[in-house]
Interface confidence: low
């Protein structure tokens, strides 16, 4: 009979609001009280096995005790009622679980969408977390008809797809109810015609056709989605070149009504474009479709839009009356070539008389010219036609170049090597920039680029390496030939030298030593040598450091101690740090050169009656590594 509970707790399955107060009552049964000789005074309340302080208890009568909780903040509390029996043994009477949470908030931002070919789906914001099982029900009705409720699934509590087919051109009213053990709330009602909530399927079968007549256009065609029979459409057409990542857009006003084709203009010739299209209800009410599948097309070729960069070099070893000239040019980038370049046409005109035409497949042409002035022209040809001509004056042999650029500067920024100059006063047709890596091991093989005559700052467009010394030459080109070149050295990025200088003694005295070293080869400098530091020490002394200007190749150490072994090394510094060279040792002599004669004979008295000759070895104890 004691398996029957000794009492009970009321309420039995409480759900309470977080941060509210709650009172539970434990009522003992008479038979239990008699058996254990107890009453309500013997009741002990516990939560999650911890005893509740007596101050929270109230004895209602001999059979009942209550406990009160203020500001409940736990989501789940195990509450037990226990009695103290013989000898203070605790006997469990009854237990309940207090579940706490919050009532639902009013659902907000209710909206619906009709994906073409699917049933209407509505979604909403449910508000704060309730910590309780909360049911959301989407309700909908016509003025004359209630539709079946749509109960949101537990794993998607903020949306529901209705079970009825969408009817357009009839208004529907929709709202959401949220309910849990602590309350029930209703969202605002929304009233709309589902035709204004349509998201069409994307246009399909998008294709691209080019035009032989016009190299700047491509015609798009597509099939509209079926919803076209219910609503009028407008479109968003985007395009990009095949290797670009950002899209351009056709102006919306050009595609604001139902159609199944469109001609895109102002495109670049001989360029592959990628297109995509989406659509929505013409008046802008509703949703844009997803993008169509992409489609590619290539515009037709056009004649090259620019003359190639054009320059020349004269072989310094020329025969009497003749000189070898290498004409050279750069391939046009695709956006200027406008097609496949088939060949180049070069004409050479000697002063006042036509000379020669050449058709060349390469980007250089070597010709033998007399010492006269020549004018060279260059055009690039593709399937459609020729570029404008690039014109170069090759002056006569006795031509004196003048008017160089001024204030030439070169500096790195943003991983590029920039070159800047002040323009000469004369009218410059173009500038030629040449650059090469200075090296003791290899000749300076130049790359080059051309800039318009209006430019006075540019960066070198080549694959430049870090810690290499670039010799950069800028030549202004005038109508009558090139101006004087100006050159400057620069580094894309400096590094500490890869080797330090090797120091040696040029001359060693009793109290000073003249040190000398060679300038570091350019291949190991890795930057502009800004200064040297000489470190020297004796075996037992502290090291002394002396800074020396980078223009020097020798330095005199003074205030040295005679007859002493010195260790010396040198470091060279660029803007990015320094590098030590090998250590070198030398010994200062005991006597200066003039002191030898005075010291050679030491008097008898000093030697205790003997005369001793100091050996040369004693005087010149002087060794090099």
């Amino acid at each position: 009979e004691l398996l029957d509970p000794c009492g009970y707790i009321s309420p039995e399955s409480p759900v309470v609001q977080l941060h509210s107060n709650f009172t539970a009552v434990c009522v003992l049964k008479e038979k239990c009280m008699d058996y254990f000789h107890v009453n309500a005074n013997y009741i002990v309340w516990k939560t999650n096995h911890f005893t509740i302080p007596k101050e929270q208890y109230t004895i209602i009568n001999r059979t009942a005790s209550s406990v009160t909780f203020t500001d409940i903040s736990s989501l789940n509390i195990q509450l037990t009622c226990n009695i103290l029996t013989f000898g203070q043994l605790e006997q469990n009477v009854y237990g309940i679980t207090i579940i706490s949470g919050l009532p639902p908030e009013k659902p907000k931002n209710l909206s619906c969408i009709v994906n073409e070919g699917k049933k209407m789906r509505c979604e909403w914001n449910r508000g704060r977390e309730t910590h309780l099982e909360t049911n959301f029900t989407l309700k909908s009705e016509w003025a004359t008809h209630k539709f079946a409720d749509c109960k949101a699934k537990r794993d998607t509590p903020t949306s529901c797809t209705v079970d009825y087919s969408t009817v357009y051109f009839v208004n529907i009213e929709v709202w959401v109810e949220a309910e849990n053990a602590l309350g029930k709330v209703t969202s605002d009602h929304i009233n709309f015609d589902p035709v204004y909530k349509v998201k069409p399927n994307p246009p399909h079968n998008l294709s691209v056709i080019n035009s032989e007549e016009l190299s700047s256009i491509l015609k798009l065609t597509w099939t509209n989605p079926s919803i076209k029979s219910v609503i009028r459409l407008k479109y968003n057409i985007q395009y990009r070149t095949k290797d670009a990542s950002t899209w351009s857009q056709i102006p919306p006003e050009d595609t604001a009504s139902t159609r199944s084709s469109f001609t895109v203009q102002d495109l670049k010739p001989f360029t592959e474009y990628v297109f995509r299209i989406c659509c929505m209800k013409e008046d802008g009410k509703g949703y844009w479709s997803d993008w169509s599948e992409e489609a590619n097309g290539i515009t037709y070729e056009d004649r090259p839009s620019k003359a190639p960069s054009f320059w020349y070099k004269i072989d310094p070893s020329h025969a009497q009356g003749y000189r070898t000239v290498q004409l050279m040019w750069k391939t046009l980038p695709p956006f200027e070539a406008n097609g496949k370049i088939l060949d180049y046409e070069v004409t050479l005109t000697r002063w006042k008389s036509h000379l020669q035409n050449y058709t060349v497949n390469d980007t250089k042409l070597t010709v033998n010219l007399t010492n006269d002035r020549y004018v060279a022209t260059l055009t690039a040809r593709n399937l459609v036609g020729k570029s404008d001509a690039a014109v170069l004056t090759i002056p006569a042999c006795d031509f004196q170049a003048t008017h160089p650029v001024m204030d030439l500067k070169a500096f790195p920024k943003d991983n590029m090597l920039w070159v800047e100059w002040t323009t000469p006063r004369e009218s410059v047709k173009k500038y030629i920039l040449e650059w090469c890596v200075l090296s003791d091991k290899a000749p300076c093989i130049a790359d080059w680029q051309q800039e318009d005559g209006t430019v006075h700052r540019t960066h070198l467009r080549g694959n430049l390496a870090e810690s290499k010394c670039y010799l950069i030459t800028v030549t202004p080109v005038y109508a009558d030939g090139p101006g004087s070149p100006e050159s400057i050295k620069a580094y894309l990025k400096q590094a500490p030298p890869s080797k330090g200088p090797t120091v040696r003694t040029k001359k060693v005295g009793k109290n000073e030593a003249v040190l000398e070293w060679d300038q570091l080869p350019v291949d190991v400098q890795n930057g502009f040598i800004r200064n040297y530091t000489i470190f020297y020490r004796t075996i037992i002394g502290n090291e002394t450091a002396v800074n020396v200007d980078s223009s020097h190749t020798e330095y005199t150490l003074s205030s040295l101690t005679s007859d002493t072994l010195y260790m010396v090394r040198m470091a060279a510094y660029t803007d990015e740090g320094g590098k030590d060279g090998p250590e070198f040792t030398f010994t200062t002599p005991k006597f200066a050169q003039g002191e030898i004669e005075e010291q050679k004979l030491i008097s008898e008295e000093d030697l205790g009656g003997e005369q001793k000759l100091i050996s040369e070895e004693d005087l010149h104890h002087h060794h090099h590594h």
């Epitope: 500096f411 920024k413 803007d575 990015e576 740090g577």
Partner: antibody
Amino acid sequence: EVQLVESGGGLVQPGGSLRLSCAASGLTFSSYEMNWVRQAPGKGLEWVSHISSAGSTKYYADSVKGRFTISRDNAKNSLFLQMNSLRAEDTAIYYCAGYNYAYYYFGVDVWGQGTTVTVSS
Amino acid sequence: DIQMTQSPSSLSASVGDRVTITCRASQSISSYLNWYQQKPGKAPKLLIYAASSLQSGVPSRFSGSGSGTDFTLTISSLQPEDFATYYCQQSYSTPPITFGQGTRLEIK
């Protein structure tokens, strides 16, 4: 992240001294030409002093010449301004600011948040 | 030393306006002119370098032009966050770094 953080500002009496420090991080400090620039309350920016990247060359505005000394410790990524014989007109926010020696044409692109110096009796 | 003169010294404008600030150098400084923006309690921030190059991270509504002695900073469509003080600075002959006296741009 490139950062310059000034410290050492405070209230000082006329004729007194202060030493401002600027700690650099996130940049190759030894490649930066550094400056102190100040801004008096409600006024514009006034250049105070400059030190070359290696610390060998120093320049001062006429208004502080002989009273202020700029220095740097590249090993510790630090810049300093020793201010002696302070006057009321030296009251300002002092910014340390720099540029990579190679990018000098491209403006002072690194600034500290400033430290306030008040000279008042 | 090269002197820099800004005009106007203050200017009232509304969001969406096009605003122009000018800076004149006492001698030719080629295109070595930089513009800074300073908001109250903050350090100056480099906006434009070399007269017309936009510093990384600066919105494209800011632009600069000019060379020699006359330079212009233009904000094509003023945004609320653009109300601040603007300074020009020459880097043709430095040190000293010389700034203009500043142009305070405030909401009309």
